[in-house]
Amino acid sequence: ELCDDDPPKITHATFKAVAYKEGTMLNCECKRGFRRIKSGSPYMLCTGNSSHSSWDNQCQCTSSAARNTTKQVTPQPEEQKERKTTEMQSQMQLADQVSLPGHCREPPPWENEATERIYHFVVGQTVYYQCVQGYRALHRGPAESVCKMTHGKTRWTQPQLICTGETEPSQFPGEEEPQASPDGLPESETSRLVTTTDFRIQTEVAATMETFIFTTEYQ
């Protein structure tokens, strides 16, 4: 079951998944000037059996100018720098990730990949939040959001995180020392506390799972 909407936005925070549940789809997006090869799949799919999960299909990009060839164009120095950053970060992420049953790791970057990764998450997916550079985390509970299904609808739980002030950023799980969060209040109370308004429906969007995609910055 795909999640109908995207995870909550927290001011001055970003989020990522440590691992992706089977059924997750990742769009094969290419950077400007490149396009998906004609025979290529439009997305990668996290699939698996009882012992191993992996991404089905591989994303491939080709130059928009080179109509009849899949020959890769040598990146310009600027692109090379960007590509290297992506590669390094991807390797760090892969090193950080634990092998969770029924989950795929972050897919490695592909040649001329777009800077944005568009995921279609499934019920049960967890994403983790951290404050951006220059902000520190105030925790009321776990800095994570889970896509869950209740009453036949999907929604993301509200992460118990506020980012404030000038200091070092907090870490995602698996990156150096994860910040210890103080004991949270019971869910019945925290759920009513987590936003400044008395909102149960956080940022609801009337969208169908066919049309809704979730975008995360990948750079």
């Epitope: 299904m149 019945s188 149960r200 429906i201 969007v205 009337a206």
Partner: antibody
Framework: QVQLVQSGAEVKKPGASLKVSCKAS????????MHWVRQAPGQGLEWMGW????????RYAQKFQGRVTVTRDTSISTAYMELSRLRSDDTAVYYC???????????WGQGTMVIVSS | DIQMTQSPSTLSASVGDRVTITCRAS??????LAWYQQKPGKAPKLLIY???SLESGVPSRFSGSESGTEFTLTISSLQPDDFATYYC????????FGQGTKVEIK
């Protein structure tokens, strides 16, 4: 304090339509889903459907598809449940209920008794 | 549809008794189960949500537990105010309720 106040009891003839209102107060109406549940005399609880009070998105139980319509008017913080082509077995108390922090129904209306009889 | 089988349908007990009511789901519902108390002529009142979380303001003598697809509501020491009908509700898929358990005075 949170309150859900429903419209009064009604007597309807078979084939007629019914519209029950549920006025919410004491909380941000558009921040919560509203559900409708009914209970026939001496029977158990039966879920009918829900509405997202913010977007207006709605879902209905299979049993009531095509007969039930749930709407809301955010300007007056009121949800409505309309049931058409009434039959005698639609005689029941109809409740609106707010879906709360734990995803269960934390506040209920007082109920609206509806008798369908010729 | 997910079916909820609640037992017993009627339970005779005395003040001070420990009472347990069981609800079995026809398939996995994670922990998306609630318990309600209803008195004649009144709307149901939420006691437990998410299988074991106690709703605010509900006495601690009420507790919920789960084991797979079987869920239990326990009243540790029955009080005069607890004689009522109790319903379980699954809300993983579209909501369905158990048939109810009437707790009456022995």
């Amino acid at each position: 304090q949170v309150q859900l106040v429903q419209s009064g009891a009604e007597v309807k003839k078979p084939g007629a339509s019914l519209k029950v209102s549920c006025k919410a107060s004491g909380y941000t109406f558009t921040g919560y889903y509203m559900h409708w549940v009914r209970q026939a005399p001496g029977q158990g609880l039966e879920w009918m459907g829900w509405i997202n009070s913010n977007s207006g998105d709605k879902r209905y139980a299979q049993k009531f598809q095509g007969r039930v319509t749930v709407t809301r008017d955010t300007s007056i913080s009121t949800a409505y449940m309309e049931l058409s082509r009434l039959r005698s077995d639609d005689t029941a108390v109809y409740y609106c209920a707010r879906e709360g922090a734990g995803d269960a129904f934390d506040f209920w209306g007082q109920g609206t008794m509806v008798i369908v009889s010729s | 549809d997910i079916q909820m089988t609640q037992s017993p349908s009627t339970l005779s007990a005395s003040v001070g008794d420990r009472v347990t009511i069981t609800c079995r789901a026809s398939q996995s519902i994670s922990s998306w189960l609630a318990w309600y108390q209803q008195k004649p002529g009144k709307a149901p009142k939420l006691l437990i949500y998410k299988a074991s979380s106690l709703e605010s303001g509900v006495p601690s003598r009420f507790s919920g537990s789960e084991s797979g697809t079987e869920f239990t509501l326990t009243i540790s020491s029955l009080q005069p105010d607890d004689f009522a009908t109790y319903y379980c509700q699954q809300y993983n898929s579209y909501s369905t309720f158990g048939q109810g358990t009437k707790v009456e005075i022995k």
